[in-house]
Interface confidence: low
């Protein structure tokens, strides 16, 4: 059963490279297990950037090697992506799945444009 | 070995009810959610029912909800299939699926039992 | 629900063709596909699902592909244990449906 999946449109990155959205999913079910995948789309590819399984109510759970980080509240998931240099710019794609307990719902967003400036080289100073 | 066998079925008379059975062998039958699939004689595959692994929740297409009940017991590895209010158009080889998951998390059937016919005539 | 719609219904083909099915669905469901296999009097057989990803012991003659509403199960060299119905299922949420099948059969 689809989803609707609501992020926003354009995101710029910190000149750290960092970059945050909301991602808000209307559940339709009391799901007690979600899973939030950020997909990155460029040149027609669509990558897996991250993924995490979350218990309602608990924080969600990246992998250590990954670079988002997010918390949940309700029906709301606050991503974060770090590290991001400018080839990073591109779609981001916010997935969500009920997964548990069944009906499964899937609810895919329209994305969320990140764009990534590298900082400026700070000139050398005598 | 992932084995599923299914008993239970036969011949009813339309209004009748009937109880599949089945019994889960070579894995752990708590971690996975489970369905039942049937097949019409001649005809395609149809999704009949899942339940979740701790048996809480239940779904069912429109064509059976509130006359199919599916309900397991994980002590004694078994998926049920309580059939009430059959139909001619119940008549099938009625499947037991276990589900699998992928990264995505999304199911789909993976392992299937032999089926048991279940016919709905007078 | 989501239709799936199955193509061709019969197939008729020799051993080593190279054979192709399709199977449309209604809607977008991105890459949430199944294929099974069933041969007469047995039950069906999970062959790939996610669209493309072959399921343990599957032999690597049959593979899949596609994504949104049109997908392709492809067999490059047909075997005798190949002749069977193929069905195909998406796994994109509740209600799962299946196509009406295509049944493989020997020239």
């Known amino acids: 059963k689809a989803m609707h999946v609501a992020q926003p449109a354009v995101v710029l990155a910190s000149s750290r490279g960092i970059a945050s959205f909301v991602c808000e999913y209307a559940s339709p079910g009391k799901a007690t297990e979600v899973r939030v995948t950020v997909l990155r789309q460029a040149d027609s590819q669509v990558t897996e950037v991250c993924a995490a399984t979350y218990m309602m109510g608990n924080e969600l759970t990246f992998l250590d090697d990954s670079i988002c980080t997010g918390t949940s509240s309700g029906n709301q998931v606050n991503l974060t992506i770090q590290g991001l240099r400018a080839m990073d710019t591109g779609l981001y794609i916010c997935k969500v799945e009920l997964m548990y307990p069944p009906p499964y719902y899937l609810g895919i967003g329209n994305g969320t444009q990140i764009y990534v400036i590298d900082p400026e080289p700070c000139p050398d100073s005598d | 070995e992932v084995q599923l066998v299914e008993s239970g079925g036969g011949l009813v008379q339309p209004g009748g009810s009937l109880r599949l059975s089945c019994a889960a062998s070579g894995f752990t039958f708590s971690s996975y959610t489970m369905s039942w699939v049937r097949q019409a004689p001649g005809k395609g595959l149809e999704w009949v029912a899942t339940i979740s692994r701790g048996g809480g929740y239940t779904s069912y297409p429109d064509s059976v909800k509130g006359r199919f009940t599916i309900s397991r017991d994980n002590s004694k590895n078994t998926l049920y299939l309580q059939m009430n209010s059959l139909r001619a158009e119940d008549t099938a080889v009625y499947y037991c699926?276990?589900?699998?998951?992928?990264?995505?998390?999304?199911?789909?059937?993976?392992?299937w039992g032999q089926g048991t016919l279940v016919t709905v005539s007078a | 629900d989501i239709q799936m719609t199955q193509s061709p219904s019969f197939l008729s083909a020799s051993v080593g063709d190279r054979v192709t099915i399709t199977c449309r669905a209604g809607e977008n469901i991105y890459s949430y596909l199944a294929w099974y296999q069933q041969k007469p009097g047995k039950a069906p057989k999970l062959l790939i699902y996610n669209a493309r990803t072959l399921a343990e012991g599957v032999p690597s003659r049959f593979s899949g592909s596609g994504s949104g509403t049109e997908f392709t199960l492809t067999i490059s060299s047909l075997q005798p244990e190949d002749f069977a119905t193929y069905y195909c299922q998406h796994h994109y949420g509740s209600p799962r449906t299946f196509g009406g099948g295509t049944k493989l059969e020997i020239k």
């Open positions: 699926a276990r589900e699998d998951y992928g990264s995505s998390y999304v199911h789909w059937f993976a392992y």
